[in-house]
């Protein structure tokens, strides 16, 4: 079976809810692909460890990628 | 708060077919993955099948592969599992369970369970 | 798919500490989750993900993991913890969900 016949999503479900960009570890977001036909956004908590998938639609979590973005290029020379 | 109630089971012979429903309540249901789980009398859980938030992706054990049907309606909130060429082995308490969000997909809620008894 | 090993049975005297272990390749992979069932009941989710507790959970229930076996401890053990206890995770393969075959937990 060729691979672009299996799909491989991370994300069952979505949480809309909002989080805190200081409670990130890691953000990561994952663009559609031939294994997975939507974007997947997975935020890596610092406390619990816990990998949990945001809703890429949700305002609360567009919010947030624009405060992350505006994070780092703040820090960015 | 979360509540999971099933609908479905009973007695049916081999080779014909169930339908088994969950009603979801309490939660945003279309942000949520659905799994079906099952326990044959006296054994463990057997994971069965998986549907993700917006139906597009399922995913099922080798044992029920191309005779179980998991599907969804975000409208009615309810999650559906429709056994067909039912097996003797098929015999168990079947639990609607809720994925969580992380990408462990670990169930966190189950429903009541149904029993669905395949014999002749 | 991968399978997650449990022992079949695991006695602790009431109020010692008692260790529920679960090994499997996906566990290097996934964070294994743990559910209490008694009989005639559905199975609750116990602990989750690093070392989380759902509300409800008393906080003599706690997770752990290293390399492919994944813990979960009971600190103070009960008569109500007297139960069936499985763990569960994502296979390696990524599409498919595995549970342990179960440990018969006795509080004596």
């Known amino acids: 079976v060729p691979l672009s016949r299996t799909v491989r999503c991370t994300c069952i479900s979505i949480s809309n809810q909002p989080v805190n960009p200081r409670s990130l570890e890691k953000l990561e977001i994952i663009p559609a692909s031939q294994f997975c036909p939507r974007v997947e956004i997975i935020a890596t908590m610092k406390k619990k460890g816990e990998k949990r998938c945001l809703n890429p639609e949700s305002k609360a979590i567009k919010n947030l990628l624009k405060a992350v973005s505006k994070e780092r290029s703040k820090r960015s020379p | 708060q979360v509540q999971l109630v099933q609908f479905g089971g009973g007695v049916v012979q081999p080779g014909r077919s169930l339908r088994l429903s969950c009603a979801a309540s309490?939660?945003?249901?279309?942000?949520?993955?659905m799994h079906w789980v099952r326990q044959a009398p006296g054994k463990g859980l057997e994971w069965v099948a998986v549907?993700?938030?917006?139906?597009?992706?399922?995913y099922y054990a080798d044992s029920v592969k191309g005779r179980f049907t998991i599907s969804r309606e975000n409208a009615k909130n309810s999650v559906y599992l429709q056994m067909d060429s039912l097996r003797v082995g098929d015999t168990a308490v079947y639990y609607c369970?809720?994925?969580?969000?992380?990408?462990?997909?670990?169930?966190?809620?189950w429903g009541q369970g149904t029993m669905v008894t395949v014999s002749s | 798919s991968s399978e997650l090993t449990q022992d079949p049975a695991v006695s602790v005297a009431l109020g010692q500490t008692v260790r529920i272990t679960c090994q499997g390749d996906s566990l290097r992979s996934y964070y294994a989750s743990w559910y209490q069932q008694k009989p005639g009941q559905a199975p609750v989710l116990a602990i989750y993900g690093k070392n989380n507790r759902p509300s409800g959970i008393p906080d003599r229930f706690s997770g752990s993991s290293s390399g492919n076996t994944a813990s979960l401890t009971i600190t103070g053990a009960q008569a109500e913890d007297e139960a069936d206890y499985y763990c569960n995770s994502r296979d390696s393969s990524g599409n498919h969900v595995v549970f342990g075959g179960g440990t018969k937990l006795t509080v004596l």
């Open positions: 369970t809720r994925a969580g969000y992380s990408t462990d997909w670990h169930p966190d809620y």
């Open positions: 549907i993700s938030y917006d139906g597009s992706i399922k």
């Open positions: 309490g939660f945003t249901f279309s942000s949520y993955g």
